[in-house]
Interface confidence: low
């Protein structure tokens, strides 16, 4: 089935924004929030922000989480505050990570 | 070391103008939104009204009170957020502070410049 | 629009822990944040994003946000910390940008 389309003037949520693509912003406004955990040069990397449009996310954030990727979205004002994503293995930790908080 | 130093200040009749300035160094003032916030003699502070940074569309936010008579405006190439004041009133009498907005918080605050409005 | 309530005052003896409360509906929706003030200075950040410390504020500062409640609360209190404090909540998409009405924290002795 295909996805709803949002509405001519979708509601913007306020998120948490942490990363690179933040600037100096600590929020951002859009369609939906995430909150991210890749794996960069060994390093765990924590990202959260948003999608401005609706398409951006869409793919995003139906993509499953892989051995080195997880996103997981949300709907609604700072939702991805207290979220954060996690790697699919549980309990195995991968070898020579470390938690590396992009701020 | 992130400094802001308000100016402009003074005193002015009711219905009168006056245009306060704000110079900012020690940081990237171009990245940064900017708030002007208020402080009635002997009370709290009031919120007045933001500017984004023109990365985040430039946009200007105002308080109820002062909206359609207040403008913020801000010069990147000068480091300078400014505030114009019009139609100005008796309840406008405060000590006017800068501040860095980092959208949660407001991260560093000038040391203010008292407006008094009075005839 | 949203109102924040402050008790006006509070006193604390040298040592011992103060907590100013800052209530209002839906504040868990939102982050807040803490200033300290000192007579004839402009206000400092002391605690952003409901629990966070800027750097440079002292660990005996903490805060927290849960039920309708922000709570600031100042673990052996000095008596440098007599200021007043202001709790702040925004909420752009909803048009709030909301100070509390301040508390005086006097520290006895």
């Known amino acids: 089935m295909e996805d709803e389309k949002p509405k001519v003037n979708p509601k913007l949520y306020m998120c948490v924004c942490e990363g690179l693509s933040c600037g100096n912003e600590d929020h951002c406004e859009g369609q939906q929030c995430f909150s991210s955990l890749s794996i960069n040069d060994g390093f765990h990397v924590y990202q959260k922000g948003c999608f401005q449009v609706y398409e951006q996310g869409k793919m995003t954030c139906k993509t499953p989480p892989s051995p080195g990727q997880a996103v997981e979205c949300c709907q609604g004002d700072w939702c991805n505050r207290n979220i954060t994503a996690q790697l699919p293995t549980k309990g195995k930790s991968f070898p020579g990570t470390q938690n590396f908080h992009l701020e | 070391e992130v400094q802001l130093v308000e100016s402009g200040g003074g005193l002015v009749k009711p219905g009168g103008s006056l245009r306060l300035s704000c110079a900012a160094s020690?940081?990237?003032?171009?990245?940064?939104?900017m708030s002007w916030v208020r402080q009635a003699p002997g009370k709290g502070l009031e919120w007045v009204g933001r500017i984004k940074s023109k990365a985040d569309s430039g946009t200007t936010d105002y308080a109820a009170p002062v909206k359609g008579r207040f403008t913020i405006s801000r010069d990147d190439s000068k480091n300078t957020l400014y505030l114009q004041m019009n139609s100005l009133k008796t309840e406008d009498t405060a000590v006017y502070y800068c501040?860095?907005?980092?959208?949660?918080?407001?991260?560093?605050w000038g040391q203010g410049t008292l407006v008094t409005v009075s005839s | 629009d949203i109102e924040l309530t402050q008790p006006p005052s509070v006193s604390v003896s040298p040592g011992q822990t103060a907590s100013i409360t800052c209530s209002g509906d839906?504040?868990?929706?939102?982050?807040a944040s803490w200033y300290q003030q000192k007579p004839g200075q402009a206000p400092v950040l002391v605690i952003y994003?409901?629990?966070n410390r800027p750097s440079g504020i002292p660990e005996r500062f903490s805060g927290s946000n849960s039920g309708n409640t922000a709570t600031l609360t100042i673990s052996g209190t000095q008596a440098e910390d007599e200021a007043d404090y202001y709790c702040?909540?925004?909420?752009?998409?909803?048009?709030?940008?909301?100070f509390g009405g301040g508390t005086k924290l006097t520290v006895l002795g």
């Open positions: 702040y909540v925004t909420a752009p998409w909803k048009s709030i940008w909301v």
């Open positions: 994003r409901d629990s």
């Open positions: 020690g940081f990237t003032f171009s990245s940064h939104a």
């Open positions: 501040a860095r907005d980092y959208g949660v918080a407001f991260a560093y």
């Open positions: 839906s504040i868990p929706s939102f982050f």
